[in-house]
């Protein structure tokens, strides 16, 4: 008896982080023994959709002409084979943005910023929401993200960062989201510029921490449970 | 019990579009594909389509492609069937099957069908 | 597209008989192959799914089998109900394919 069929890989392009109204193409790859190939969505109760194998049979696409909020959430795929199903592929997690308004991102006391001191990067939106996140660009893990306890609505976080050197210097954006949908990313905020100068080469900071906020070394991510996808947002901007 | 009940006869004239309806109970409507099945007289079936009632995903026959189109209205659990640029050929009784999602991907309950008759 | 292919496109028996219908597909459909009953004027109904499973309600006089390209259909004691255009299908690929259909008379 032959062990269990490998699983499939199931990647997003052109990422995993996707505009309203923009096209994305979801692939599985498989075997070349591939017969057939099923899409799953969580909370979907028929399979997503199924498609035949392309030539030479070990993947298939999923085509997403324009995105929408339907189309935002948690995937997997499987392939049959002449013995029959595959396991599930890992989760593949499609996020939308442009769900809501965008926020406006700001620092305080100033973009410009000397190496050992503090700054602290605002993100306010006009509506109140619960998880804020700030991307920055070209990070290995540009993923940082505040929620608020208890699912309390507010219409700020802050991301205190402290002492500053010039690993933080860069481009930052921000989102807003509500936590009835992880999937679901405001408009990205206007770019924000941070500058550090006079740098002092000391060694990678561990920012401030306080209750209120979740914001992580580029190299360590505060992930909780429950936050918005890693995956898909690292991926997109990297 | 499973049922799925069509739209009645259509006469229509070439080049015009017929629109079947296909409305199912008994079960729950956005769980299983549904798969729309023409027979033509005296031939046998052809398979047009298929369709998710939960999103509306789709895929057809190559042969169908550019004219028949597959909707959904979750609202009413029916699903329907457009047919347009029709000519005599596609004279048939047009069938509504839902999909048993499991080995064999099988057509497990069928509506009784809608004679459509394209005739000058 | 696999094309299926049905033998003989239609047969004579006698109540009591056992009958046995073929399909051969143009390629491995990997056991996913169907067969449905279906009566003058009315719906097709299925009858056996994945090769030789027996749908609800489906008596059991009705059996299929076969793998790989080939695959038969058995009515093991015919009955004057029994009389219809029988088709396999299969489940493999799409788009979904038919067998152009066994005509089954009583003699």
């Known amino acids: 008896q032959a062990g269990p069929l490998p699983k499939p890989t199931l990647w997003a392009e052109p990422g995993s982080v996707i505009s309203w109204g923009n096209s994305v193409t979801i692939w599985c790859q498989g075997t070349l023994e591939a017969r057939e190939y099923r899409l799953d969505k969580e909370e979907s109760p028929a399979p997503w959709d199924r498609q035949n194998p392309l030539e030479p049979k070990n993947k298939a696409r999923f085509s997403i002409p324009s995105m929408t909020e339907d189309y935002a959430g948690r995937y997997r795929c499987y392939y049959r084979s002449p013995v029959g199903w595959s396991q599930p592929s890992d989760p593949l997690e499609l996020v939308m943005t442009g769900a809501y308004s965008k926020p406006t991102l700001s620092a305080l006391p100033s973009p410009l910023v000397t190496s050992g001191k503090s700054v602290t990067l605002l993100c306010q939106s006009r509506s109140p929401m619960d998880t804020f996140l700030l991307i920055k660009e070209r990070a290995a893990h540009p993923l940082l993200h505040l929620r608020s306890e208890h699912g309390a609505q507010q219409h700020q976080a802050e991301f205190p960062m402290s002492p500053v050197t010039s690993v933080h210097g860069g481009t930052y954006r921000c989102f807003s989201s509500h936590g009835f949908s992880h999937y679901l990313l405001s408009h990205p905020s206007d770019p924000l510029e941070l500058i550090v100068s006079g740098s002092l080469e000391d060694p990678r900071p561990s920012p401030t921490r306080s209750v209120s906020t979740a914001a992580g070394p580029e190299d360590q991510p505060l992930m909780p449970t429950g936050s918005v996808p890693h995956s898909g947002l690292r991926r997109h901007w990297e | 019990q499973v049922q799925l009940v069509q739209s009645g006869a259509e006469v229509k004239k070439p080049g015009a579009s017929v629109k079947v309806s296909c409305k199912a109970s008994?079960?729950?409507?956005?769980?299983?594909?549904m798969h729309w099945v023409r027979q033509a007289p005296g031939q046998g079936l052809e398979w047009i389509g298929e369709?998710?009632?939960?999103?509306?995903?789709?895929n057809y026959n190559e042969k169908f492609k550019s004219r028949a189109t597959l909707t959904v209205d979750k609202s009413t659990s029916t699903a329907y069937m457009e047919l347009s640029s029709l000519r005599s050929e596609d004279t048939a009784v047009y069938y509504c099957?839902?999909?048993?999602?499991?080995?064999?991907?099988?057509?497990?309950?069928w509506g009784q069908g809608t004679t459509v008759t394209v005739s000058s | 597209d696999i094309q299926m292919t049905q033998s003989p496109s239609s047969l004579s028996a006698s109540v009591g008989d056992r009958v046995t219908i073929t399909c051969r597909a143009s390629?491995?459909?990997?056991?996913?192959l169907n067969w449905y009953q279906q009566k003058p004027g009315k719906a097709p109904k299925l009858l056996i799914y994945?090769?030789?499973r027996l749908h609800s309600g489906v008596p059991s006089r009705f059996s299929g089998s076969g793998s790989g390209t080939d695959y038969t259909f058995t009515i093991s004691s015919l009955q004057p109900e029994d009389i219809a255009t029988y088709y396999c299908?299969?489940?493999?690929?799409?788009?979904?394919?038919f067998g152009q259909g066994t005509r089954l008379e009583i003699k």
């Open positions: 099957a839902r999909d048993r999602y499991d080995e064999g991907n099988a057509m497990d309950y």
């Open positions: 008994g079960y729950t409507f956005t769980s299983y594909w």
């Open positions: 369709i998710n009632p939960s999103n509306g995903r789709t």
């Open positions: 390629q491995d459909i990997t056991n996913y």
């Open positions: 994945y090769t030789s």
């Open positions: 299908q299969q489940g493999d690929t799409l788009p979904r394919t």
